[in-house]
């Protein structure tokens, strides 16, 4: 029995990490690294905060929560199987050996391939780079990501597709949004 955080290939993974600031806005540095927490610092740092802000991050890694309130949970965007493993969240509390260290296990599973309705298949074939999954946890919701390299005619066509397709209903029911740009 062990706590593990799960995501499918292509989804966003979520790794929780929390601490209680001594006072609101009284932040301590935090680092996230790939691999178990070493004696000091984080190995293979992917993100770091200081007393004020996020001061270092690498692509695909970001903080989604309100880190000023102590929510320093990590989101890893568009995961691959290679993202599996142990991650270290380290709360760097001033003083000797005061750090709080958390080793969190991330398990990435291959994406489930589910047969889609014909209409949806046509839609994704026309705009193959549009559909992505965002969020975390077992109850995933579908969200339309950004629309790079699509001109106004295509957007108009897309709007018509959405208006009369079953996908529109599916998306509306799941609270999905379309972001353009």
């Amino acid at each position: 029995s062990e706590v593990e955080y799960r995501a499918e290939v292509g989804q966003n993974a979520y790794l929780p990490c929390f601490y209680t600031p001594a006072a609101p806005g009284n932040l301590v540095p935090v680092c996230w690294g790939k691999g178990a927490c070493p004696v000091f610092e984080c190995g293979n740092v992917v993100l770091r905060t200081d007393e004020r802000d996020v001061n270092y991050w690498t692509s695909r890694y970001w903080l989604n929560g309100d880190f000023r309130k102590g929510d320093v949970s990590l989101t890893i965007e568009n995961v691959t199987l290679a993202d599996s493993g142990i991650y270290c969240c380290r709360i760097q509390i001033p003083g000797i050996m005061n750090d709080e260290k958390f080793n969190l296990k991330l398990v990435i599973k291959p994406a489930k391939v589910t047969p889609a309705p014909t209409r949806q298949r046509d839609f994704t074939a026309a705009f193959p780079r549009m559909l992505t999954t965002r969020g975390h946890g077992p109850a995933e919701t579908q969200t339309l990501g950004s629309l790079p390299d699509i001109n106004l005619t295509q957007i108009s066509t897309l709007a018509n597709e959405l208006r009369d397709s079953r996908l529109a209903n599916d998306l509306r029911d799941s609270g999905a949004t379309i972001r353009i740009g």
Epitope: S1, E2, V3, Y5, Y14, P16, F18, T20, G65, D66, K69, G70, D71, S73, M97, N98, D99, E100, K101, F102, N103, H136, G137, P138, A139
Partner: antibody
């Protein structure tokens, strides 16, 4: 198999102290924090505090700061909670539980009865 | 301290029914809520953590959802063995706090 073993019961007199134990097995003891909870009938669950078995660092609920002291013995993979100056208010079931912010494995619980 | 409010102290349902238990939090805790099941005479057991993650070995009839201040725990098809008290817990800030519990009775 991961287990946290606690004595079933402790009987103590008012004003005395008691030291409760929680023996961990089936995992690396220093890998996860150990928390302590109090449960009284009709009062739900209260978080007393936690200890990091690796560093010995502790954090307490203010409400229990002068009542509970958390320690560990790494060689025996055992966590301890000492409760001092006991009154009838401390009659309850006390659980140890592991992990960081929530509790994936709970001990069997120790029923503490404070009575003269 | 963060207050966790489980408005229903008791809930009664029949085997096979769907039941939802709610937990309201006094301040925004992101998705930092766990749910536990405590059967009579037993220690609590972790079912859901970080609002929606099922713990290893927990049947998929148990589910959690919510974020911010409103959280829901659902049993999609109640079984006789689900008779228990269910607690929510916030794991956002210390002191960690629990709801007062919802006692699920099976008719």
């Amino acid at each position: 198999q991961v287990q946290l073993q606690q004595p079933g019961a402790e009987f103590v007199k008012p004003g005395a102290s008691v030291k409760l134990s929680c023996k961990a097995s089936g995992y690396t003891f220093t890998s996860y924090w150990m928390h302590w909870m109090k449960q009284r009938p009709g009062r739900g669950l209260e978080w007393i505090g936690r200890i990091d078995p690796d560093s010995g660092g502790t954090k307490y609920n203010e409400k229990f700061k002068n009542k509970a002291t958390l320690t560990v013995d790494k060689p025996s993979s055992t966590a301890y909670m000492q409760l001092s100056s006991l009154t009838s208010e401390e009659s309850a079931v006390y659980y140890c539980a592991r992990y960081y912010w929530f509790f994936d494995i709970w001990g069997t619980g120790t029923t503490v009865t404070v009575s003269s | 301290d963060i207050v966790m409010t489980q408005s229903h102290k008791f809930m009664s349902t029949s085997v096979g029914n769907r039941v939802s238990i709610t937990c309201k939090v006094s301040q925004d805790v992101s998705t930092a809520v766990a749910w536990y099941q405590q059967k009579p005479g037993q220690s609590p057991k972790l079912l859901i953590y970080s609002a929606s993650y099922r713990y290893t070995g927990v049947p998929d009839r148990f589910a959690g959802s919510g974020s911010g201040t409103d959280f829901t725990f659902t049993i999609s098809s109640v079984q006789a063995e689900d008779l228990a008290v269910y607690y929510c817990q916030q794991h956002f800030n210390t002191p960690f706090t629990f709801g007062s519990g919802t006692n699920l009775e099976i008719k």
